[in-house]
């Protein structure tokens, strides 16, 4: 599931990883848009074991997954979570 995530927390990510995470381990991908308490866009992957990983938005693998998910859900936009 791709989710646009709004938070009052300042940046959640300090270090970002480019390491590939297999889709079978991914529960949800949260995107925090730039300017939402943080000057940069953040991509947070929730793994099924409840660990959270900050992913480099430029990582090829995350861009591929996000593009695929966007196409899949193009009829219904991501649900904002507050």
């Amino acid at each position: 599931v791709l989710e646009v995530y709004y938070t009052h927390l300042r940046c959640r990510c300090v270090q970002e990883s480019s390491v590939f995470i297999p889709r079978r381990f991914i529960d949800r991908i949260q995107i925090s848009p730039r300017g939402n308490g943080c000057p940069r866009k953040e991509i947070i992957v929730w793994k099924k074991n409840k660990s959270v990983v900050c992913v480099d938005p430029q990582a090829e693998w995350i861009q591929r997954i996000m593009e695929m998910l966007r196409k899949k859900s193009s009829s219904t936009p991501p649900v904002p979570v507050f």
Partner: antibody, heavy 123, light 111 residues
């Protein structure tokens, strides 16, 4: 606003099972990333994490108590519960329910707390 | 388990004083460049209240006289100018590894 309220018997006999319920408002137990849990504080002592449960029913327990503890939730009632079996006087404490912040999953913190309920174990 | 050791266990101070409480973890609580160390304030008969999360982030509504610092295993909570309402017990907590663990507490008393 976020609120949590503990309820349950104030007195439990040794060897019996302690049962507590936390009723929540201002948030849903089924929202993605939501976690809630229990912490206790024996008289005059510090805080001890007991257990927490996630939106998807995944449960995490303190290994020191795991064999005696069960945490569960009823999303339709906005409640979650704690059961602690085979209690002894050492389980006498104030029991708090709390909500996890919801930002870092298994590395999160307790952002909201109930006011606590005192449980005494005595015959 | 990660052991959390606070010092001092009790402390007497006066209104206006600058106070520092330390918390040492038995192993690093850092991950992803973040220190998963949090501080709570507890007044007698009340529930703990979150003051600081991620070692140095001030919880909304908490006065700016409270600050936190540190990384790895060593952390401090500082109150820059003690107010009467600050006399309480303070706890650190780590959440980098299960089980989440708390320090034993530091009781801040009026001198």
């Amino acid at each position: 606003q976020v609120q949590l309220q503990e309820s349950g018997p104030g007195l439990v006999k040794p060897s019996e099972t302690l049962s507590l319920t936390c009723t929540v408002s201002g948030f849903s137990l089924s929202t993605f990333g939501m976690g809630v849990g229990w912490i206790r504080q024996p008289p005059g002592k510090g805080l001890e994490w007991i257990a927490h449960i996630w939106w998807d029913d995944d449960r995490r327990y303190n290994p020191a108590l795991k064999s005696r503890v069960t945490i569960s939730k009823d999303t339709s009632k906005n409640q979650f519960s704690l059961k602690l079996s085979s209690v002894t006087a050492a389980d006498t404490a104030v029991y708090y329910c709390a909500r996890i912040a919801g930002y870092y999953g298994s590395r999160d913190w307790f952002a909201y707390w109930g006011q606590g309920t005192t449980v005494t174990v005595s015959s | 388990d990660i052991q959390m050791t606070q010092s001092p266990s009790s402390l007497s101070a006066s209104v206006g004083d600058r106070v520092t409480i330390t918390c040492r973890a038995s192993e690093s609580v850092d991950n992803m460049g973040i220190s998963f160390m949090h501080w709570y304030q507890q007044k007698p008969g009340k529930a703990p209240k979150l003051l600081i999360f991620r070692a140095s982030d001030l919880e909304s509504g908490v006065p700016s006289r409270f600050s936190g610092s540190g990384s790895g295993t060593d952390f401090t909570l500082t109150i820059s100018s003690l107010q009467p309402e600050d006399f309480a017990t303070y706890y650190c907590q780590q959440s980098n590894k299960d089980p989440w663990t708390f320090g034993q507490g530091t009781k801040l008393e009026i001198k």
